[in-house]
Interface confidence: low
Amino acid sequence: SEVEYRAEVGQNAYLPCFYTPAAPGNLVPVCWGKGACPVFECGNVVLRTDERDVNYWTSRYWLNGDFRKGDVSLTIENVTLADSGIYCCRIQIPGIMNDEKFNLKLVIKPAKVTPAPTRQRDFTAAFPRMLTTRGHGPAETQTLGSLPDINLTQISTLANELRDSRLANDLRDSGATIRIG
């Protein structure tokens, strides 16, 4: 059965998925898709990485963790009820039928009130999409609404903090983390 994750309309949803690269920078391709993991690849791909980098993405879908260290957790920005459903995180380990597949169920709840910018540092506030004219450098960083400015280093640190605490327990239970090599 899928591990269930929840978010409210207007928030950012966070779907954790991790692997441990055999060596730093020795990346494994990963795809994220909407819908349960099929036999091969991902259906309805929303984001993809290759051995080097993120090489495909669609609007509102981001990897805000340190994917070079295997944090390929997906952030979905400003979710709506239509974002509910199963998401597939597929870690595409070389070799026949070696892929690791994780199905994560996202449940979107109607907002209790009209969503307003929040300053709390929870899952959704911790990973605002960084808006610049082009890039993600802290010199240019603005965040949605009045969320606190968080640069890339802070995001990595925050991701580690979250992973070490609340996420670690979730992931140990769900098995959504693997070691490669």
């Epitope: 993405w57 004219t133 082009r134 993600h136």
Partner: antibody
């Protein structure tokens, strides 16, 4: 095989216009950022402009802002650099290069062969 | 804009020599630095990305490292085909900026 091929360079008078093209093959430009980088004769590399995969974001060097426009036609898998109000200091070889979506990892892994733009009266 | 100060501007070396080129960023750029090699009349080629990652197909004699805002490109044993101009580039913020280049010549 990934390839970028620039065209459209040539001799133009100060104040004139040129449109450079960057035809991509071996990959889909809608999945990548495309950059223009120039190199004046005997000088170093200078970034000029870029466009994100969805065309939603464009950026320009201060030296060309308001004069140059970057665009892309994903159906033709081609990026363009429209250069207006050209000046002598715009004389350079212009390269297009492929970049990645996330600025943090946005080094340029493939480059075209370059096209020479000469602005002179 | 972030300035990338590259040194030396040129150097003479022999085949087999260990060569080190440095680049200093005027402010923090995390690990977002790339190194390129350019030969006369040719386009630059990516050697190193994200400060220390060797790009696919690049010989292992090339390596990159970071110490704070200082970045180093090392060629462990210079080969005849390595005589070229090398550029660093930061890609942390817009605009991405390049160092002024280091020309590696035959001694």
């Amino acid at each position: 095989e990934v390839q970028l091929v620039e065209s459209g360079g040539g001799l133009v008078r100060p104040g004139g216009s040129l449109r450079l093209s960057c035809a991509a093959s071996g990959f889909n430009i809608s999945n990548y950022a495309i950059h223009w980088v120039r190199q004046a004769p005997g000088k170093g590399l200078e970034w000029v402009a870029d466009i994100t995969p969805d065309g939603g974001y464009t950026d320009y060097a201060d030296s060309v802002k308001g004069r140059f426009t970057i665009s892309a036609d994903t159906s033709k898998n081609t990026a363009y650099l429209q250069m207006n109000s050209l000046r002598a200091e715009d004389t350079a070889v212009y390269y297009c290069a492929r970049g990645y979506v996330y600025r943090m990892w946005d080094s340029f892994d493939y480059w075209g062969q370059g096209t020479l733009v000469t602005v002179s009266s | 804009d972030i300035q990338m100060t590259q040194s030396p501007s040129s150097l003479s070396a022999s085949v087999g020599d260990r060569v080190t080129i440095t680049c200093r960023a005027s402010q923090d750029v995390n690990t977002a630095v790339a190194w390129y090699q350019q030969k006369p009349g040719k386009a630059p080629k990516l050697l190193i990305y994200s400060a220390s990652f060797l790009y696919s197909g690049v010989p292992s004699r090339f390596s990159g490292s970071r110490s704070g805002t200082d970045f180093t490109l090392t060629i462990s044993s210079l080969q005849p085909e390595d005589f070229a101009t090398y550029y660093c580039q930061q890609h942390y913020t817009t605009p991405p900026t390049f160092g002024q280049g280091t020309k590696v010549e035959i001694k």
